[in-house]
């Protein structure tokens, strides 16, 4: 990373250093330490104070983004004296060169696309690179397949999501021969970026008085069970006047996904389609293929 770290410290320095790969802030241990604390302040003056590691000469920041620039601070008291040191972590490089409009989505349960746009002041030879680290920080994933626009990486396709956890850190670095390129970073929850497939195995069975719709929950990247799903059924009578209201039915996920509704014979031709969402987010999938039942002369 091209970020330059500037230290603001008194004469006897703690030698504070920050490793952006592990998000670990460390300093030289002092003898007879009685108190130590570390924290960061971001550009909006929000303070993040993590727990100190056991040896008390380092701390790890779990869920932080650095692209707006932050200031780290370490306070140490020993039985003899007090130490205080600031470490500025700016996002160096020309303003407006970082990747922008960054977003990712998971689809088909095991694929992910991330896209971004070139920074407005980025030079023509800019190249961007995406790195992903999971919340356990055990592994860094480098983008395996870049999507390009005139030779510049503007997206990434991943077909192996095994390294991801429920929350992940995304970093887009940039390089250029002409000038320094700023980085962009973001924390994303997999549950918020997954787009579900529509429900599968949709069937309709009718008897003389009722019709029973059954379906299977979609396969998802997240480990979800039946109560995590909400469904919407669109039961639609065919050949009705334009502007006629469709009947939208909300159904909670269940061990056996089914919806039974009165429909007596002879019944007109109807179609039913279903979509699915996470019950807490209601980010609807696309509709399943319409299934027809009934007859034209009903």
């Amino acid at each position: 990373e091209k970020s330059d770290l500037r230290t603001v410290a008194p004469a006897s320095s703690l030698n504070v250093r920050f490793d952006s790969r592990t998000m670990n802030l460390s300093w030289d241990c002092q003898e007879n330490t009685t108190f130590s604390k570390c924290f960061l302040t971001d550009k909006k003056n929000r303070v993040v104070e993590p727990r100190l590691s056991n040896n008390e000469c380092s701390c790890t920041f779990r869920e932080i983004c650095l692209h707006e620039g932050v200031t780290f601070e370490v306070h140490v008291n020993t039985s003899q004296r007090g130490f205080q040191q600031k470490l500025l972590y700016p996002n160096s490089g020309r303003e407006g060169t970082a990747a922008q409009n960054f977003s990712c989505f998971i689809y088909n349960a095991d694929l992910m696309n991330c896209t971004w746009a070139r920074g407005p002041t980025a030079p023509r030879d800019v190249q961007y690179f995406l790195y992903i680290r999971n919340s356990k920080r055990r592994r860094e994933i480098r983008c395996p397949y870049y999507i390009q626009d005139s030779g510049t990486h503007v997206g990434c396709h991943l077909d192996n999501l095994s390294g991801l956890t429920s929350r992940n850190y995304f970093l887009v670095n940039g390089t250029s021969r002409e000038i320094g390129i700023q980085f962009f970073d973001s924390l994303l929850d997999t549950k918020k970026i997954e787009r579900f497939n529509p429900p599968s195995n949709v069937t309709v069975r009718c008897n003389t008085t009722h019709c029973l719709v059954r379906w299977k929950q979609p396969r998802t990247y997240q480990k979800l069970s039946y109560l995590d799903f909400q469904y919407q059924l669109d039961v639609h009578r065919k050949n009705t006047q334009p502007g006629t209201e469709n009947l939208l039915i909300n159904v909670s996920g269940d061990l056996e996904n089914r919806y039974n509704f009165p429909s007596s014979e002879p019944r007109a031709k109807h179609s039913v389609k279903i979509r699915a969402a996470d019950v807490r987010i209601l980010n609807w999938s696309s509709w399943s293929e319409a299934i027809e039942f009934g007859s034209d002369d009903g």
Epitope: S166, L224, S225, L227, D228, L255, E256
Partner: antibody, heavy 120, light 111 residues
């Protein structure tokens, strides 16, 4: 109709082991996750363990670690709980439950329970 | 001693509204982890009433509702009926214990 059918009541001596079964009907066990919870009049409900999707394995409550084993036979849609080195305070009703959501986790459907009595 | 604290009993006349509190800590309800509520009729297995803090599974009447704030949660039963007489338990996840935790239960009596 999905049901969890548990094995019958057991009486065991201290130091012995007990194996409780939980058969799922109306659904495939391979598509579900089972957890085990016990209930005593004094301690109330105690979670014992079950499948954790983040770890992709069965995890056990710390207090039962080393004494408890949870297994599954998906060919007959049956889950098993084995508790060894039984003590009198293991006398309880043991429930299997289907996880309806891993966020919680939420126990969407419970078996009727198996009464295990530990007495000399 | 249960990790989540509930009153041991509450009572109300038919048609009345009763509420049951469930108090946890920063490692469970306040972490924040979701809260579920279960009803246990005498001599039977527990039945899920509420999940994800305030969602009702299909088949549970809308007389049952729940909410969560900070390190506490509560269950409300409106239009109390004789067959609501049961024990009610709250449940959540606790990060320090790395597993599910339950309340000690509240006996609801319909006067």
């Amino acid at each position: 109709q999905v049901q969890l059918v548990q094995s019958g009541a057991e009486v065991k001596k201290p130091g012995a082991s007990v194996k409780v079964s939980c058969k799922i009907s109306g659904h495939s066990l391979s598509e579900l996750s089972i957890h085990w919870v016990r209930q005593t009049p004094t301690k109330g409900f105690e979670w014992m363990g079950g499948f954790d999707p983040e770890e992709n394995e069965i995890v056990y409550a710390q207090r039962f670690q080393g004494r408890v084993t949870m297994t599954e036979d998906t060919s007959i849609d049956t889950a098993y709980l084995t508790l060894s080195s039984l003590r009198s305070d293991d006398t309880a009703v043991y429930y299997c439950a289907i996880v309806g959501s891993f966020s919680g986790p939420v126990y969407g459907l419970w078996g009727k329970g198996t009464m295990v009595t530990v007495s000399s | 001693q249960a990790v989540l604290t509930q009153p041991s009993s509450v009572s109300g006349a038919p048609g009345q509204r009763v509420t049951i509190s469930c108090t946890g800590s920063g490692s469970n309800i306040g972490a924040p982890y979701d809260v579920s509520w279960y009803q246990q009729l005498p001599g039977t297995a527990p039945k899920l009433l509420i999940y994800h803090n305030n969602k009702r599974p299909s088949g549970v009447p809308d007389r049952f509702s729940a909410s969560k704030s900070g390190t506490s949660a509560s269950l409300a039963i409106t239009g109390l009926q004789a067959d609501d007489e049961a024990d009610y338990y709250c449940q959540s996840y606790d990060s320090s214990l790395s597993g599910s935790v339950f309340g000690g239960g509240t006996k609801v009596t319909v006067l």
